[in-house]
Amino acid sequence: TLNSVLINSNAIKNLPPPLGGAGGQPGSAVSVAPGVLYEGGNKYQTLDNYQPYPCAEDEECGSDEYCSSPSRGAAGVGGVQICLACRKRRKRCMRHAMCCPGNYCKNGICMPSDHSHFPRGEIEESIIENLGNDHNAAAGDGYPRRTTLTSKIYHTKGQEGSVCLRSSDCAAGLCCARHFWSKICKPVLKEGQVCTKHKRKGSHGLEIFQRCYCGEGLACRIQKDHHQASNSSRLHTCQRH
């Protein structure tokens, strides 16, 4: 029905009801919260100048900055890191984020990312945003690294929590699955982890929180000690073939 939502398809067990319903069992259908009907950049003002801006990753810096220790080229080295001005064309670099927009890091040098340099058909435009630290990049007034990437040369795969469109956008060991109303990279399930077995295609309701599929060599089967349980509450886990 319209107001029935499957909250736990391939979601983690003991899920708190996301839409005001009861229960967190895999596949449990819940009613939508009262007052809700299912139908089936701002650049923020800064509170102060706060310069130089400390950071933990490139995504926390502006589009023309990268995150690094002031005295070192690479981020992640000990000491406080701050947002530094991007490197212009032909300057030395260690990663793409160090280069100014329109450039990328190739062989340690910032080069122009002019697509005309690449053979036709080799370009796969793909915008991957790292959501690992979920909100740092975009919400207040930051800029995520929005870069048009070439698949063969410097395609960055989404890490866990990155917004994705398909599983091929995600790094190894991750798949693209629904989370709330969006899609993010989530871990592929390991042996013993709870999974969701759909009886028939199209039979499941609205899946607010999807889990990934079981990893290689694993299948989603009823957990042996749950055979006696009622049909509706049988627990499925990833098991060896």
Partner: antibody, heavy 114, light 112 residues
């Protein structure tokens, strides 16, 4: 630059319609669920509607159901809110908002008055 | 709906002094993904919400470190270690774990 820009607000008579737009840029719009939230003059925020990343699933607040329709065009990176049968109590600044990594637009003012 | 209750509703602070705002939710905001979907934002007259804190304690980029958030489950606190003149406005908490998103009534912060 990562941003959401709303447009389409204005003064409209009760019972009439208005369509709001929200242009997204700088992020993978088609991967995010998008929301509309409104704020009546001098009041707090009120959640209005949500649409899933692919546009297939939509939810509405009771106060607007049957009158408002949320939609999106991922090819154009645009979110819409079609508002029909407008009432005086719909007067508010309407914000579009991105979920997960919360981002809001500057808002567009809708005034329903005879 | 999840009810969000803020206290106090107004706060008058001397510049340089600390300030603290409480927010209580009607049910736990802890999700099974391990995140707690509680936000703090500031709104100034005629401006959109300016987000300060996400997931209870994480500062959005460019937010000064005098702002900090804490709490878990249903009880949350926003602290400003040293209030500055530009910090005036209405502070709101918000939850996004469940539809509809709901908001606290707001705490008006003014300078003495």
């Amino acid at each position: 630059q990562v941003q959401l820009v709303e447009s389409g607000g204005g003064v409209v008579q009760p019972g009439r319609s208005l369509r709001l737009s929200c242009a997204a840029s700088g992020f993978t719009f088609s991967g995010y669920g998008m929301h509309w939230v409104r704020q009546a003059p001098g009041k707090g925020l009120e959640w209005v509607a949500v649409i899933s990343y692919d546009g297939n699933d939509k939810y509405y607040a009771d106060s607007v159901k049957g009158r408002f329709t949320i939609s999106r065009d991922n090819a154009k990176n645009t979110l819409y809110l079609q508002m029909n049968s407008l009432r005086a109590e719909d007067t508010a600044v309407y914000y579009c908002a991105r979920e997960l990594r919360v981002l809001w637009g500057q808002g567009t003012l809708v005034t329903v008055s005879s | 709906d999840i009810v969000m209750t803020q206290t106090p509703l107004s706060l008058s602070v001397t510049p340089g002094q600390p300030a603290s705002i409480s927010c209580k939710s009607g049910q736990s905001l802890l999700h099974s993904d391990g995140k707690t979907y509680l936000y703090w934002y500031l709104q100034k007259p005629g401006q959109p919400p300016q987000f300060l804190i996400y997931e209870v304690s994480n500062r959005f980029s460019r937010v000064p470190d005098r702002f900090s958030g804490s709490g878990s489950g249903t009880d949350f606190t926003l602290r400003i270690s040293r209030v500055e003149a530009e910090d005036v406005g209405i502070y709101y908490c918000m939850q996004s774990i469940q539809l509809p998103w709901t908001f606290g009534q707001g705490t008006q912060v003014e300078i003495k």
